[in-house]
């Protein structure tokens, strides 16, 4: 048979951050190539990454069409020199991925503190509204556009001279916090989607401290 040395893909894994979504699998091909198909539960299969020797396929363009849908992918294995060959059952070997719902499962990317401004004993901290690859009307949507009030940010802030981290939360991209006059503070933010059960938190933003470039101080 032409598929004697063809092996099915395995360990199919979705890797997704802020909706940039790649399907990965094993093994590295030896004398075989792969084609990926993706569909929604009720939709038709669409082929991607035709006859590739890679073990990953960028499916972002497909999943951003509707991030709230649940997707299934499958990876077909073909002999390298004879992609028309089929397995013993009359079709190529393939393996299904786990189901993937981008809105519920994409990892939240590391946020960035855009700026902070102190006015007296108040500090306004602004989080950058990161752009995603989700489009509406030919415009790329921000993370806030996609998730709305489902997305909150947790701010950790502390005096430069101490270790205890106070917290504040917002469902916008801005915090207004009280600080002690004459004290320097450091800040870090974390994106959170509380309604999720998995992938609820992002990694923390880089720490920004008062007295450094991003801040402004006004009496």
């Amino acid at each position: 048979s032409g598929t004697t040395n063809t092996v099915a893909a395995y360990n199919l894994t979705w890797k997704s951050t802020n909706f940039k979504t790649i399907l990965e699998w094993e093994p590295k091909p030896v004398n075989q190539v792969y084609t990926v198909q993706i569909s929604t539960k009720s939709g038709d299969w669409k082929s991607k990454c035709f006859y590739t020797t890679d073990t990953e396929c960028d499916l972002t363009d497909e999943i951003v069409k509707d991030v709230k849908q649940t997707y299934l992918a499958r990876v077909f294995s073909y002999p390298a020199g004879n992609v028309e060959s089929t397995g013993s059952a009359g079709e190529p070997l393939y393996e299904n991925s786990p189901e993937f719902t981008p809105y519920l499962e994409t990892n939240l990317g590391q946020p960035t503190i855009q700026s902070f401004e102190q006015v007296g004993t108040k500090v306004n901290v602004t989080v950058e509204d990161e752009r995603t690859l989700v489009r509406r009307n030919n415009t790329f949507l921000s993370l806030r556009d996609v998730f709305g009030k489902d997305l909150i940010y947790t701010l950790y802030y502390w005096k430069s001279s101490s270790s205890g981290k106070k917290t504040a939360k917002t469902n916008t991209n801005e915090f207004l916090i009280d600080v002690d006059k004459g004290e320097n503070y450091c800040f870090s933010v974390q994106a959170v989607i509380p309604s999720r059960t998995v992938n609820r938190k992002s990694t923390d933003s880089p720490v920004e401290c008062m007295g450094q470039e991003k801040g402004e101080f006004r009496e």
Epitope: Y156, K165, P194
Partner: antibody, heavy 120, light 107 residues
Framework: EVQLVESGGGLVQPGGSLRLSCAAS????????IHWVRQAPGKGLEWVGY????????YYADSVKGRFTISADTSKNTAYLQMNSLRAEDTAVYYC?????????????WGQGTLVTVSS | DIQMTQSPSSLSASVGDRVTITCRAS??????VAWYQQKPGKAPKLLIY???FLYSGVPSRFSGSRSGTDFTLTISSLQPEDFATYYC?????????FGQGTKVEIK
């Protein structure tokens, strides 16, 4: 089912140490925040401190700062409260609680509590 | 730190009575206030979150409201299982703080 189970309480002399455990099941602690709250006999609830197990960040009530340390082992899905230099006024039932972490909901699940008695 | 001043500290009531407990925050806490019920020897249980939202599984006779920095827990018709101690808590800022508690006893 979400569950928190505290253990490690007991009788300890003033100046002594004790480590309480809070074993979580039904959820992953690194995706939430864990707080410790205590209640002295016949008294109200007093917040002790919190940890974000994801990054290790903590904050403590002034009454325990420098004496108590909260930590977490995400591989065991367990949070800890290390109590040093214990005083009679630390005698209380100690509860761990899960912080849902939203703007609207804070401590949604609590453990059953473990009694710590500081006495000579 | 934000103080949560709860009143009364105790009250006596009969089954079927309407009961009101109040909590005043020392500064703005938005709606970040929860109410808990605690029975002797048991852990507190969440009743109301975000000042006025009933937590899952809590009977509808419990309700919460907010007016500025004043927060109210109301039990519309007290039941035998409602005799307990009730606490308010703000989680608007760190550290979170609790009210002193209100013990609801049988008249």
């Amino acid at each position: 089912e979400v569950q928190l189970v505290e253990s490690g309480g007991g009788l300890v002399q003033p100046g002594g140490s004790l480590r309480l455990s809070c074993a979580a099941s039904g959820f992953t602690i690194s995706q939430y925040w864990i707080h410790w709250v205590r209640q002295a006999p016949g008294k109200g609830l007093e917040w002790v401190g919190y940890i974000d197990p994801y990054n290790g960040y903590t904050y403590y009530a002034d009454s325990v700062k420098g004496r108590f340390t909260i930590s977490a082992d995400t591989s065991k899905n367990t949070a800890y409260l290390q109590m040093n230099s214990l005083r009679a006024e630390d005698t209380a039932v100690y509860y761990c609680a899960r912080d849902y972490g939203s703007l609207r909901v804070s401590l949604d699940y609590w453990g059953q509590g473990t009694l710590v008695t500081v006495s000579s | 730190d934000i103080q949560m001043t709860q009143s009364p500290s105790s009250l006596s009531a009969s089954v079927g009575d309407r009961v009101t407990i109040t909590c005043r925050a020392s500064q703005d806490v938005n709606t970040a206030v929860a109410w808990y019920q605690q029975k002797p020897g048991k852990a507190p249980k969440l009743l109301i979150y975000s000042a006025s939202f009933l937590y899952s599984g809590v009977p509808s006779r419990f309700s919460g409201s907010r007016s500025g920095t004043d927060f109210t827990l109301t039990i519309s018709s007290l039941q035998p299982e409602d005799f307990a101690t009730y606490y308010c808590q703000q989680h608007y800022t760190t550290p979170p703080t609790f009210g002193q508690g209100t013990k609801v006893e049988i008249k």
